[in-house]
Interface confidence: low
């Protein structure tokens, strides 16, 4: 609450955070020309990347191209993409859609269809749908530990959000735990209004705000986080401005002295920890 | 402006970027002693990395140390690290500058300098000038798409930078178009009156302002993003302070049962985004 | 000092870090059943990754689970974990503590312990102490040099933590050099009051605090930075929250065809460097 | 490992014909995209002909377009090249080269296994 007489100060604020949790991931696979079903253990290495303290993301889907090599290939043939002769193919032009640089020449694609030929990673990347359900969907029973360190330094004053009372073997509930710092991922879609499932297909962000109203007068002490959650990423957004929350990177390696990548396109939840409150003294 | 009668609160936000671009890199490559010009092409998973969403980072620049392994070698001759006698070299001796921990010999490096022989990944580090003009200068082409959702938690107001009606295929122009959130890198540049071509060689840090000015109350709301661009290194600093913006990493493999490592020196501009601001009501 | 007449404005902070430093790491290393001592070099690129500005992390130990491959096989005997029937093993549970998914069966982990089967990444973790001492414990002689670029935009404000004056081979000391921002590892936990070789076992969090107490009043004009240095996670907590900081990530490879893993638990230091002040104007 | 092994190659008149074969061994054939590539004394290998893995699509370099023809015959793990009104500049060591990520052969990059090579020689 507003104490008018106080000197109010914003908080310093250090976070780290510990996802937990395993996913059995069941696709298909393609080698040699015959598919058949792959099952994979995902943990923490495999879905986490080792981010900053108030940030985490957690891989709930995926897209792989395997073994593109740096080459001259068709594109791919998408919307608006396809040619028919090498008049509609531009030496040098780069489409920002495209994944190559275009050589000039139209080349067969498959059959039936003919796109520009680029110099690129190939066989350039299939932009097909990301897998529907999601492929570690099951990450929405993973958890997280979230330790705030909070700091006044005009005040003089620092505190945390765990303390030695705390049970480490709790989950935050916003009734029956609500200092508990241990969160279930499907938990905090919840409290946000969400679907874990829906918005694991294409990713997305989402925000767990502490706040910190702090009374640092000795004589009516309270220093408590508060949690809440909303998502931050627009989930209307129109198809140009990119929905969702996915980025690629790439598992590069030599065969047969060759050069060569696996390109992954990553869907996942980017969860973003926003510390604010005050803390006030007469 | 400012409004004496509102109640002011500091911006919450959440920042999400998106980079656009293809760089077709030409250099000479050497494999068995002979010399050719290598073509290659660098799409987003090879320029750029998985960071946070307040920072990006494009690669404008490299220097590869390829197929080092650990071993004794003689440490590169820059200014100052040759020796003629074993009594130049300190066994066990670690020079900030070198890559190594000397042996205390001091071993030939080519026909005519001999350096101290070291314990370090071999061969070492050669202390080459970045290529100038830089090998993905193209990059000044590239277009980042950036997303920001802000919060002034006290006034339970959310929005963001992206409105439905704009339009996905824009490009941000501080006369013509200062509301569209994509900015093509080399407009960045040139807005802060910086070179890119010039910058993209030693790489740089370039900040990106968003600020928000909002009048929240109804009969005069207001709530846009002005955006603002400076940079944020020092161009004239003193070489002993590391100008510039670069750092190391290392792709790991197994060759013959050897571990061996490729050492990337990647030059390049990191974009900070720096949001700020606030939010008024009566 | 409060200045009542002034307008104080909070602080936009930009932060450029670099770490330097060669650490020999000496371990005991398996191979064909033959255990010998190793010798290794770490450099940045071995111990530190590209991470943030305000941020930036030192491995100081780690764990090694080499050649994990996706198959079956028996958890790690941990506390509880031992089984001496299938019934004591439930099909499809995923223990939060165990690396895998029960397949339901109970099998010989060596020749007197038997524990639940599962699917995971073989052979699983050994859940083993971190090594004492730690292994890059010379991490404590690594100096980081840190560029800091502040803004007030409300009174069109810029300056920096280095100034031309500065000399590039100073070393911070709070009497001595208080201005220099090269900063020795274990001095920044001296002035903290902690034990850099014990918290490089589990690793840890430091904060560097940069204060800025900005007058910007062109009569009385003084803005120059303020370090002091404090821990930030907590050195008495409760095992189950998971005390000092490590993460664990994988180098994955293809060994005969077969996706394999090494798995490292990287303990080590992070250190966030936490920008804050006012400037002040009438 | 696969094995590629060339035949068919020859002295012949500029303006005759040569049929060159690539057996493959070792590998599925199918899951191979093919191509034929050359190197005349003291030139750089070139890329002459490429074909997909299902032998549907295939490029050819413009300096054989309309003479050469390339196909393949998954049953029998073999690829052919046609060649027709052939001239003294065609004159070099012949290989047959594969790759298990293109889905066609469109130039000398990102090939894999390699044959040992065939003479060809058109005399004026």
């Known amino acids: 609450s507003d104490k008018l007489y106080q000197r109010k100060e914003p908080v310093i604020s250090s976070v780290h955070t510990k996802v937990k949790g395993i996913a059995e991931v069941t696709e298909n696979v393609t080698e040699g020309g015959v598919t058949k079903l792959g099952h994979s253990i995902f943990d923490t290495a495999d879905y986490t990347f080792p981010l900053q303290g108030n940030s985490f993301f957690v891989m709930t889907n995926y897209v792989k191209s395997e073994g593109q090599v740096q080459t001259l290939c068709p594109e791919y043939p998408r919307r608006g993409a396809q040619c028919s002769s090498d008049r509609r193919c531009k030496k040098g032009w780069m489409d920002p859609q495209s994944k190559g640089i275009q050589t000039g020449r139209c080349v067969p694609y498959d059959k039936t269809r003919k796109t520009c030929e680029v110099s690129a990673w190939c066989p350039t990347e299939e932009e097909k749908e990301a897998p529907r359900p999601a492929l570690l969907r099951s990450a929405e029973n993973f958890t997280v530990l979230i330790k705030n360190n909070i700091h006044f330094p005009g005040h003089n004053y620092t505190t945390r959000n765990i303390l030695p009372t705390m049970n480490g073997s709790c989950t935050f509930h916003k009734t029956w735990d609500p200092q508990c710092s241990i969160f279930r991922l499907g938990d905090i879609f919840q409290e946000a209004g969400e679907n874990f499932t829906e918005v694991a297909v294409q990713g997305g962000i989402m925000g767990i705000e502490i706040y910190w109203d702090c009374n640092l007068d000795s004589w009516s002490h309270h220093c408590r986080p508060r949690y809440s959650f909303r998502r931050l990423d627009d989930k209307n957004m129109d198809e140009s401005f990119v929905p969702g929350y996915n980025f690629r990177y790439a598992k590069y390696y030599k065969e047969n002295n060759v050069e060569k990548r696996t390109l992954i396109k990553a869907f996942g939840i980017r969860f973003d920890i926003l510390v604010f409150g005050t803390g006030g003294k007469f | 402006s400012d409004k004496l009668y509102q109640r002011k609160e500091p911006v919450i936000s959440s920042v999400h970027t998106k980079v656009k671009g293809i760089a077709e890199v030409t250099e000479n490559v050497t494999e068995g002693g002979v010399t050719k010009l290598g073509h290659s092409i660098f799409d987003t998973a090879d320029y750029t990395f998985p960071l946070q969403g307040n920072s990006f980072f494009v690669m404008t620049n490299y220097v590869k140390s390829e197929g080092q392994v650990q071993t004794l070698c003689p440490e590169y001759p820059r200014r100052g690290a040759q020796c003629s006698s074993d009594r130049r070299c300190k066994k066990g001796w670690m020079d900030p500058q070198s890559k190594g921990i000397q042996t205390g010999r001091c071993v030939p490096y080519d026909k005519t300098r001999k350096t101290c022989e070291v314990s370090a990944w071999c061969p070492t580090e050669e202390e080459k000038e970045a290529p100038r003009p830089a090998l993905l200068r193209s990059a000044e082409n590239f277009t980042v798409l950036i997303k920001n959702n802000i919060h002034f938690p006290g006034h339970n107001y959310t929005t963001r930078n992206i409105l439905p009606t704009m339009n996905g295929s824009c490009t941000f122009h501080k006369t013509w178009d200062p509301q569209c959130s994509i900015f093509r890198l080399g407009d960045i540049f040139q807005e802060a009156g910086e070179n890119f071509t010039e910058v993209a060689v030693q790489g740089g840090i370039m900040g990106i302002e968003i600020y928000w000015d909002c009048n929240l109350d109804s009969w005069s709301h207001h709530c846009r993003p002005r955006y603002s661009f400076r940079r944020l290194d020092d161009k004239n600093m003193d070489e002993s302070f590391v100008p510039g913006y670069n750092f190391r990493y290392a792709k790991y493999y197994k060759e013959n049962n050897v571990e061996k490592r490729t050492l990337i020196k990647a030059f390049g501009i990191r974009f900070d985004i720096l949001v700020f601001g606030t939010g008024g009501k009566f | 000092s409060d200045k009542l007449y002034q307008r104080k404005e909070p602080v936009i902070s930009s932060v450029h870090t670099k770490v330097k430093g060669i650490a020999e790491v000496t371990e005991n290393v398996t191979e064909g059943g033959v255990t010998k001592l190793g010798h290794s070099i770490f450099d940045t690129a071995d111990y530190t990754f590209p991470l943030q500005g305000n941020s930036f992390f030192v491995m100081t130990n780690y764990v090694k689970s080499e050649g994990q491959v996706q198959t079956l096989c028996p958890e790690y005997p941990r506390r509880g974990a031992q089984c001496s029937s299938d019934r004591r093993c439930k099909k499809g549970w995923m223990d939060p503590q165990s690396k895998g998914i029960q397949t339901g069966r109970c099998v010989p982990y060596d020749k007197t312990r038997k524990t639940c089967e599962v699917s995971a990444w073989c052979p699983t973790e050994e859940e083993k102490e971190a090594p004492r001492p730690a292994l890059l414990r010379s991490a404590e002689n690594f100096t980081v040099l840190i560029k800091n670029n502040i803004h007030f935009p409300g009174h069109n404000y810029t300056t920096r933590n280095i100034l031309p004056t500065m000399n590039g081979s100073c070393t911070f000391h709070k009497t001595w050099d208080p201005q220099c921002s090269i900063f020795r590892l274990g001095d920044i936990f001296q002035e903290a009051g902690e034990n850099f070789t014990e918290v490089a076992v589990q690793g840890g969090i430091m904060g560097i605090e940069i204060y800025w107490d900005c007058n910007l009043d062109s009569w009385s004009h003084h803005c120059r930075p303020r370090y002091s240095f404090r821990r930030l996670d907590d050195k008495n907590m409760d095992e189950s929250f998971v005390p000092g900081y490590n993460f664990r990530y994988a180098k994955y490879y293809k060994e005969n065809n077969v996706e394999k893993r090494t798995l490292i638990k990287a303990f080590g230091i992070r250190f966030d460097i936490l920008v804050f002040g006012t400037g002040g104007k009438f | 490992e696969v094995q590629l092994v060339e035949s068919g190659g020859g002295l012949v008149q500029a303006g005759g014909s040569l049929r060159l074969s690539c057996a493959a061994s070792g590998r599925t054939f199918s899951s191979l995209a093919m191509g034929w590539l050359r190197q005349a004394p003291g030139k750089e290998r070139e890329f002459v002909s490429g074909i997909s893995r299902g032998g549907t699509s295939t490029y050819y370099a413009d300096s054989v377009k309309g003479r050469f023809t390339i196909s393949r015959d998954n049953a029998k793990n073999t690829m052919y090249l046609q060649m027709n009104s052939l001239k003294p500049e065609d004159t070099a060591v012949y290989y047959c080269?594969?790759?298990?990520?293109?889905?066609?052969?469109?130039?000398?990059?990102?090939?894999?296994?390699w044959g040992q090579g065939t003479q060809v020689t058109v005399s004026s």
């Open positions: 080269a594969g790759s298990p990520v293109l889905s066609i052969v469109l130039d000398t990059r990102g090939l894999e296994y």
